[in-house]
Interface confidence: low
């Protein structure tokens, strides 16, 4: 009985952007301005976010779709869907409560944002330093004297990737 | 599927080393950060260092520089943890943590390797 | 060596909800966002909970919450549940020269 009556269920008609309106015999009312369905069949329409203060309106609100926010200039995004702002710090600093700070020696960033993370230690695979770090940069690992030969690669691979959530690949 | 698989249990005697094993699969091992964590028997976590897997820098916690060494081996996308000159407070269980944010902290760990030292 | 202070213990019963804290200094829990949480069962490697002081991993449950004021962090549980028993674990980047430091560890009792 309750299969049967689902089946038959008005509201399932409603498409995205309206509401079934219980209050006028199911029928599929238009969602009111600031809302939005973004599914059909449902009996209420969400309230759209509002970009306020520091975030910013990356796209408006419709009536199938809630609004999208990014930040203003200065800050970057965190979290899903942009959930929070956070300060940039230049290059060569990280984030701390009292603001940002530069990278201790032997340490870098090279994002606005994240930590300072550890030098490349060029010993650990028998190569020497080909260019020095910074508070901005990575060192540069050149080839062991061994290996000082013609076309020899002085490149190290990429750094790792700090962003939250890096798809694996 | 991210998995980090660990090495064996180990029974060391005092004074001996130990190279604990974590073999990653399903990322991009070159593109985290790896940490090790380990755990005594009813205590608490304890962070012993991190290695960047694709420059191989490390960075160890001061209790354990001096002893512990992190190397990785990018064929194989495996991290290796070594701990020499053990006593009876090394035992513990030894885990890898992949670290895949701008904080620092652990998302996906391995099953723990256990490391007794006894005489 | 530990540095972040956890209360031993916790319990509530089925339903209830149940906060932990994790008490630092400015120079770890109070001085950056970075704080986690992690969930151990007993003979299981731990869980990530809640990253950045309040996020949440895709399927960790939106019963855990987690938030922070000054130097110390908190956990909270609300519609508690008898998987959620288990040893919790707060963890913080730290500018000190050890860079993760790990709390004590609370043992949480679902009555």
């Known amino acids: 009985f309750e299969r049967t009556r689902s089946l038959q269920d008005p509201c399932s008609n409603c498409p995205a952007g309206t509401f079934c309106d219980n209050n006028r015999n199911q029928i599929c009312s238009p969602c009111p301005p600031n809302s939005f369905s973004s599914a059909g069949g449902q009996r209420t329409c969400d309230i759209c976010r509002q970009c306020k203060g520091v975030f910013r309106t990356r796209k408006e609100c419709s009536s199938t779709s809630n609004a999208e926010c990014d930040c203003t200039p200065g800050f970057h995004c965190l979290g899903a869907g942009c959930s929070m702002c956070e300060q940039d710090c230049k290059q060569g600093q990280e984030l701390t409560k009292k603001g940002c700070k530069d990278c201790c020696f032997g340490t870098f960033n090279d994002q606005k944002r994240g930590i300072c993370r550890p030098w490349t230690n060029c010993s650990l695979d028998g190569k020497s330093v080909l260019v020095n770090g910074t508070k901005e940069r990575d060192v540069v690992c050149g080839p062991s004297p061994a290996d000082l030969s013609p076309g020899a690669s002085s490149v190290t691979p990429p750094a790792p990737a700090r962003e939250p959530g890096h798809s694996p690949q | 599927e991210v998995q980090l698989l660990e090495s064996g249990a180990e029974v060391k005697k005092p004074g001996a080393s130990v190279k604990v094993s974590c073999k990653a699969s399903g990322y991009t091992f070159t593109s985290y950060y790896m940490h090790w964590v380990r755990q005594a028997p009813g205590q608490g976590l304890e962070w012993m260092g991190i290695?960047?897997?694709?420059?191989?820098?490390?960075s160890y916690a001061q209790k354990f520089q001096g002893r512990v060494t992190m190397t990785r081996d990018t064929s194989t996308s495996t991290v290796y943890m070594e701990l020499s000159s053990l006593r009876s407070e090394d035992t513990a269980v030894y885990y890898c943590?992949?670290?895949?944010?701008?904080?620092?902290?652990?998302?996906?760990w391995g099953q723990g390797t256990l490391v007794t030292v006894s005489s | 060596s530990y540095v972040l202070t956890q209360p031993p213990s916790a319990s509530g019963s089925p339903g209830q909800s149940v906060t932990i804290s994790c008490t630092g200094t400015s120079s770890d829990v109070g001085g950056y966002n970075y704080v986690s949480w992690y969930q151990q069962h007993p003979g299981k490697a731990p869980k990530l909970m809640i990253y950045d002081v309040s996020k949440r991993p895709s399927g960790v449950p939106d019963r855990f919450s987690g938030s922070k004021s000054g130097n110390t962090a908190s956990l909270t549980i609300s519609g508690l549940q008898a998987e959620d028993e288990a040893d919790y674990y707060c963890?913080?980047?730290?500018?000190?020269?050890?860079?993760?430091?790990f709390g004590t560890g609370t043992k949480l009792t679902v009555l």
């Open positions: 943590a992949r670290d895949p944010g701008a904080g620092g902290y652990f998302d996906y």
């Open positions: 290695i960047n897997p694709s420059g191989g820098s490390t």
């Open positions: 963890s913080s980047y730290t500018s000190s020269s050890t860079r993760y430091v």
